[in-house]
């Protein structure tokens, strides 16, 4: 993708406050790294409707992060 550079966050802007649960295919959490200094919550939408960034400060994002961390650790 020509405009995509290393050292960039994946989300442009703060993100949406919420996504309908029924529309969520999967949720990915990107933790702060050399590429991006903030946590990012990326939602893949069902029916090939692309991806959306969820505002990591939102209630829904905090719930997702908690759920994923519980699952992983």
């Amino acid at each position: 993708f020509p405009m995509f550079k290393r050292g960039r966050c994946l989300c442009i802007g703060p993100g949406v406050k919420a996504v309908k649960v029924a529309d969520i295919e999967k949720a990915s959490i990107m933790y702060p790294s050399n590429n991006c200094d903030k946590i990012e919550v990326i939602i893949t939408l069902k029916e090939n409707k692309g991806q959306r960034c969820l505002n990591p400060k939102s209630k829904q994002a905090r719930l997702i992060i908690k759920k994923v961390e519980r699952k992983n650790f």
């Epitope: 994946l10 692309g50 959306r52 969820l54 505002n55």
Partner: nanobody, 126 residues
Framework: EVQLVESGGGLVQAGGSLRLSCAAS????????IGWFRQAPGKEREGVSC????????YYADSVKGRFTISSDNAKNTVYLQMNSLKPEDTAVYYC???????????????????WGQGTQVTVSS
């Protein structure tokens, strides 16, 4: 009511400059990514540039890199596209659009945007 209004288009000679404005109302640009797109007659709409006003991140299509500069004024709720060294192939209708929750890989995908302006015509003569 949400509205995006573009202005600043016009007729300019090759090598000249124009500054487009995109004035937003009904929402705060700080909460959104604002993108500029263009559509030339008989061609597909293409993404030109994108900005996150919340952190100042800017993105450009290869075709305009080094010639166009995107910026924002949060107090005026307006995004600008400064276009220098214009070429005849830059002739198009230029649109601004707003997206929330935009992912970098989809920044120039039209369906990712929630709101669109009506466009402003830019004509570059040789």
């Amino acid at each position: 009511e949400v509205q995006l209004v573009e202005s600043g288009g016009g007729l300019v000679q090759a090598g000249g400059s124009l500054r487009l404005s995109c004035a937003a109302s009904g929402f705060t640009i700080d909460d959104y990514a604002i993108g500029w797109f263009r559509q030339a007659p008989g061609k597909e709409r293409e993404g030109v540039s994108c900005i996150s006003s919340s952190d100042g991140s800017t993105y450009y299509a290869d075709s305009v890199k080094g010639r166009f500069t995107i910026s924002s004024d949060n107090a005026k709720n307006t995004v600008y596209l400064q276009m220098n060294s214009l070429k005849p192939e830059d002739t198009a209708v230029y649109y601004c659009a707003a997206a929330q929750g935009l992912v970098v890989t989809e920044m120039f995908v039209g369906r990712s945007y929630d709101y669109w302006g009506q466009g402003t015509q830019v004509t570059v003569s040789s």
